[in-house]
Interface confidence: low
């Protein structure tokens, strides 16, 4: 079934909500609103200035960092730009991609992207998990997965971005630096913005237990972002979930795993990299829709419209987005353990339900959603599943 445009207010709302790392079923609704989760199995993030609740939250935070407006690949404005796919391969975005400022002038509901553009991104497996953004906030990862982004001294009062499953994204003040030490990979229905359930607000230097590079994008579930226990989160896309190895024995064990596990992506990846898993060989490319999340601070313009390439898996992505002074990260990137990492890398489940994450310079991260098996995914992070065409 061809991708359908997201023109309804409901859809727009869903886009805003986003899913946490753990991505809940498309029909799932979050009880609590929250920003979209960032990693799919397992990472969550907190919107700028907000608390990371899980992988989904983290993702949502990333979304917040990149901007609160949504851009669809098919929207006019960024013709010819190429974005990097989550897989690390540069993807050509439809020339119809609209600039952030243009998007702002439009309805929050982005138009559907022509199917012709779906080829631009790598195929993604049909979302196995269903996520439904809560009416309040976007989720991070279903399941995308559930990432634990919280630190040892999490701030429960901080903004919650749901991860892995459902949630709505609540606009939050953008911050130049987002400290993502640990994702909650699960996306939560309650708070769409609980990305990884980061205990502390972005920029805080809380101690986060380092987990074994477990952070998936759940997506899957985004328990760590919103389950985020799936996904994200992810629900954990960080090399180590814990900055301090002396927090708890449990945490130490996690740290050991994280150390053994390796890269930030691994650990902070949302627990439920919802929709993130790559399609196997021979898998048909599902139709897709694009949803871009421009950085708030660059919503006014899209200079150059050039794509900020992410490091390929396994490659350090820190300096790619770091600013000269080392304190700011380019749109689409967040600070993790002192370095700038792309949200696509940190939150594998950033885009739920098989959506492909892309980074466009000055615009930030956006998701290319897919339509497959009579299931249509929409939303800023493809967190919404629609089966009724």
């Amino acid at each position: 079934v061809p991708a359908r445009e997201a023109g309804s207010a409901v859809e727009a709302e869903e886009l805003v909500k986003g899913s946490p790392a753990w991505e809940p079923p498309a029909n799932d609704t979050r009880e609590e609103a929250g920003p979209p989760a960032a990693g799919e199995d397992e990472a969550s993030w907190t919107a700028p200035g907000g608390e990371l609740a899980g992988p989904e939250e983290v993702l949502q935070e990333s979304a917040a960092v990149t901007g609160t407006a949504w851009l669809e690949a098919d929207s006019p404005g960024l013709g010819g730009v190429t974005a990097e796919a989550g897989s690390g391969d540069a993807q050509a975005l439809p020339a119809t991609l609209q600039a952030p400022h243009e998007v702002l002038g439009q309805s929050i509901m982005p138009p559907a992207i022509p199917e012709a553009t779906e080829a631009s991104g790598p195929p993604s497996p049909t979302p196995g998990d269903k996520l439904s953004p809560a009416s309040e906030l976007p989720k991070e990862s279903p399941l995308e997965v559930w990432l634990n982004l919280g630190g040892s001294t999490p701030d429960p009062q901080g903004p919650e971005l749901t991860y892995p499953f459902q949630g709505t994204l609540e606009p939050q003040p953008a911050s130049d630096i987002i400290d993502i030490d640990y994702f909650e990979g699960l996306d939560g229905e309650g708070r769409g913005a609980d990305l990884g359930s980061f205990p502390g607000s972005p920029g805080t230097s809380e101690n986060h237990p380092d987990t074994e590079g477990e952070t998936p994008s759940w997506s899957l579930l985004d328990l760590y972002d919103d389950f985020t226990p799936f996904d994200e989160s992810d629900f954990y896309p960080t090399t180590s979930f814990y900055d301090d190895l002396d927090e708890e024995e449990e945490e130490e064990e996690d740290d050991k795993d994280a150390v053994g596990g390796g890269d930030l992506e691994d650990e902070n990846e949302l627990l439920v990299p919802t929709g993130k898993p790559g399609l196997g060989p021979g898998t048909g490319q599902p139709t897709s829709r694009w949803h871009a999340v421009p950085p708030q601070h660059t919503l006014g313009s899209v200079p150059g419209s050039s794509i900020a390439l992410r490091p390929r898996p396994g490659e350090p992505g820190r300096d790619l987005a770091s600013s000269e002074n080392g304190t700011e990260c380019r749109s689409g990137f967040v600070r993790h353990n002192g370095s700038c990492r792309s949200v696509c890398d940190l939150f594998p489940s950033y885009c739920h339900n098989g959506g492909q994450c892309y980074l466009v310079e000055n615009i930030g991260a956006f998701c290319r959603c897919n339509t497959q098996d009579y299931i249509w995914h929409k939303g800023m992070r493809c967190e919404s599943i629609i089966t009724d065409f």
């Epitope: 919650e160 913005a193 990884g196 987990t211 985020t228 927090e247 449990e250």
Partner: antibody
Framework: EVQLLESGGGLVQPGGSLRLSCAAS????????MSWVRQAPGKGLEWVSA????????YYADSVKGRFTISRDNSKNTLYLQMNSLRAEDTAVYYC???????????WGQGTLVTVSS | DIVMTQSPDSLAVSLGERATINCKSS????????????LAWYQQKPGQPPKLLIY???TRESGVPDRFSGSGSGTDFTLTISSLQAEDVAVYYC?????????FGQGTKVEIK
């Protein structure tokens, strides 16, 4: 040492309610997503619900959505599962599990049995 | 939902012999961005809660004996017990942690022949 201790299970009639609790210790509770997984007698495992570390995000299996509510009190290091409109098919041992960032469950409680029967 | 199918349902292996359990997912659980397979394996002994053995398809959880190993990618995975010990008698479950809802395989019962 990480410990998870569930409580609150018991016998309840169809349509009734129960609130399960899971007391956690040995790790920074608020930094981890937590989940509930159940296992019907003689059956396999079924993920029920999950919640992000901050509690801002929650997730549910379709089978319990709208009936169960997961929550947590990080100040008490406790995870909860409010179960309403219980059905016979909800009969199972309910486990709370610490959820890793990759969504795997690295620590499980011993479980609490919930029996829904008239 | 991603459906996880394990085979065989039960397996009888002699002590010291190799035991192999297969798990197939209805969708790929490989996340291309980090090349990680979101698949975990658990061991559940009678009367006990499950125990995480492997995550990311092949990473052993801390404290798990090295006779347990996981392999596979995409949709096909395998848990191998290189030399079955008496204490390994249990039911083993695979679980995809990539997307919501998180789903488990139906379980494979491993016994001693």
């Amino acid at each position: 040492e990480v410990q998870l201790l569930e409580s609150g299970g018991g016998l309840v009639q169809p349509g009734g309610s129960l609130r399960l609790s899971c007391a956690a210790s040995g790790f920074t509770f608020s930094s981890y997503a937590m989940s509930w997984v159940r296992q019907a007698p003689g059956k396999g495992l079924e993920w029920v619900s999950a919640i992000s570390g901050s509690g801002g995000s929650t997730y549910y299996a379709d089978s319990v959505k709208g009936r169960f509510t997961i929550s947590r009190d990080n100040s008490k290091n406790t995870l909860y599962l409010q179960m309403n409109s219980l059905r016979a098919e909800d009969t199972a041992v309910y486990y709370c599990a610490k959820t890793k960032p990759n969504n795997a469950f690295d620590y499980w409680g011993q479980g609490t049995l919930v029996t829904v029967s008239s | 939902d991603i459906v996880m199918t394990q085979s065989p349902d039960s397996l009888a292996v002699s002590l010291g012999e190799r035991a192999t359990i297969n798990c197939k997912s209805s969708q790929s659980v490989l996340y291309s961005s980090n090349n990680k397979n979101y698949l975990a394996w658990y061991q559940q002994k009678p009367g006990q809660p499950p125990k995480l053995l492997i995550y990311w398809a092949s990473t052993r959880e801390s404290g798990v004996p090295d006779r347990f190993s996981g392999s596979g990618s995409g949709t096909d995975f395998t848990l191998t017990i290189s030399s079955l010990q008496a204490e390994d008698v249990a039911v083993y479950y695979c679980q995809q942690t990539a997307t919501q809802p998180l789903t488990f395989g139906q379980g494979t019962k491993v016994e001693i022949k």
